[in-house]
């Protein structure tokens, strides 16, 4: 696993403990909470990050209208079960044996049940809509400059391949970033759109997951872009199954 050799830290995940005791005496970083060794050359999966977090001492129609099946994470934080690759297990349960099914970004997609609840597969979230409101500025940002800056951010900071940033919509003060990534499109080594969205969300909230880097300093043509609200919608390849309209 790659990690900064000089002082043995994980540039892409500060919620790790690193020591020079990996294979061959190399630096190895383990996610807090789970102890899973992480690859510090890329983003850590959201499931491992959420587990680490829980273990820590604790409009006009140019904008996209979220699909009726879009999920918003209303349940908040929980201590998830992750599989050996760090992905969310399809079925999550709490301490009181209440269980539910989640999608690939860990958001509940069924009613809650008991231990008999079956979640046959981990359903992939293939479309993420990040809805931002920026603080008032002297004037609106230039759309194409904003588009270019956000695409650069996802490419350089989150290492997300540009083809997965489907669109950037803007109508002052609302910005919408659409990320799309089907199962068939995601190659080995590609950053998952869910992980990129989670890192971005933590960045705009001033809770950066990167080690030692300054917080997110987003500028469009030198003008600071300061986010005052974030809402994220998740669309799954298979629509969620709730017993009634939410």
């Amino acid at each position: 696993h790659t990690a900064a050799q000089d002082n043995c830290t994980c540039p892409t995940n500060k919620m790790t403990v690193c020591s020079p005791d990996g294979p061959g005496g190399r630096c190895q970083c383990r996610a807090l909470g789970s102890g899973v060794a992480v690859d510090c050359s890329t983003l850590t999966s959201e499931c491992l990050l959420l587990k680490a977090r829980m273990s820590a001492p604790k409009n006009a129609r140019t904008l996209v209208r979220p699909n009726e099946h879009a999920l918003v994470d209303n349940d908040g934080l929980y201590d998830p079960d992750c599989d050996p690759e760090g992905r969310f297990k399809a079925r999550q349960c709490n301490q009181t044996s209440v269980c539910w099914c989640v999608n690939s970004v860990g958001v509940r997609r069924t009613d809650k049940g008991d231990l008999s609840l079956r979640c046959d597969e981990l359903v992939r979230t293939h479309h993420i809509l990040i809805d931002l409101r920026h603080r008032p500025t002297a004037g609106a940002f230039n759309h194409s400059d904003l588009d270019a800056e956000l695409r650069r951010l996802f490419r350089e900071r989150y290492r997300l391949h540009p083809k997965f940033v489907a669109a950037v919509h803007y109508e002052q003060p609302t910005i919408q970033i659409e990320l799309r990534q089907n199962t068939s499109q995601k190659a080995a080594g590609d950053v998952d759109i869910g992980d990129a969205a989670y890192y971005f969300e933590r960045d705009v909230k001033g809770e950066s997951l990167f080690q030692g880097r300054g917080g997110l300093d987003l500028r469009v043509r030198g003008e600071p872009l300061q986010v005052e609200r974030t809402l994220i919608y998740y669309l799954d390849e298979i629509p969620p199954k709730f017993s009634m309209k939410r």
């Epitope: 403990v17 020591s19 005791d21 807090l32 599989d83 050996p84």
Partner: antibody, heavy 117, light 107 residues
């Protein structure tokens, strides 16, 4: 060479706490995890938990979370495990070990803890 | 927690024979498995790390193989000094866990 020194035996009264020590030498103490392992007579090995001396980050096997407390003293390169309110179930040999890579390459001789009135 | 199941509980072989110890994990752990030998009243000794990597000072008759969920420790020509208990241990995630052990006896 790497050495982990543990006292041979400790006799403890039921309910009284005991502090087991593990003194490391021959390597950079702060750079490698110290693990604690329990072995009851005639039984297998059981991982209690570990501590990273550099920042005292600890992990525990849930089974031992309420009875074992792991600490280190960096100045003396010594790791400690406190067993609180021990019962006869805690009578066992307790090993400390350190690992190079993830295998526990270095082991102490073990401390035999006897809980008896 | 990751469960490690070792089989058989006891192995009885004659000197010079080849012997294999099995360790099965309850989920995929890649190659994050390590093997130990523990002689009577002694401390465990690391034999093999990361499923198949040899440890300096350990006789070459000890070897390991496997990945994912199934792992094997092999002694290709057993000697009388190999009488001991053998344990596998996983370091894929916390809590680290050990298998129940296999006792090697010499006929």
């Amino acid at each position: 060479q790497v050495q982990l020194q543990q006292p041979g035996a400790e006799l403890v009264r039921p309910g009284a706490s005991v502090n087991l020590s593990c003194k490391a030498s021959g390597y950079t103490f702060t750079s490698y995890w110290i693990n604690w392992v329990k072995q009851r007579p005639g039984q297998g090995l059981e991982w209690i938990g570990n501590i990273y001396p550099s920042n005292s980050y600890t992990n525990y096997n849930q089974k031992f979370k309420d009875t074992a407390t792991l600490t280190v003293d960096k100045s003396s390169s010594t790791a400690y495990m406190q067993l609180s309110s021990p019962t006869s179930e805690d009578s066992a040999v307790y090993f400390c070990s350190s690992y190079r890579s993830d295998g526990f390459a270095y082991w102490g001789q073990g401390t035999l803890v006897t809980v008896s009135a | 927690d990751i469960l490690l199941t070792q089989s058989p509980a006891i192995l009885s072989v004659s000197p010079g024979e080849k012997v294999s110890f099995s360790c099965r994990a309850s989920q995929n752990i890649g190659t994050s498995i390590h093997w130990y030998q523990q002689r009577t009243n002694g401390s465990p000794r690391l034999l093999i790390e990361f499923a198949s990597e040899s440890i300096s000072g350990i006789p070459s008759r000890f070897s390991g193989s496997g990945s994912g969920t199934d792992f094997t420790l092999t002694i290709n020509s057993v000697e009388s000094e190999d009488i001991a208990d053998y344990y596998c241990q996983q370091s894929n995630s916390w809590p680290f866990t050990f298998g129940g052990g296999t006792k090697l006896e010499i006929k």
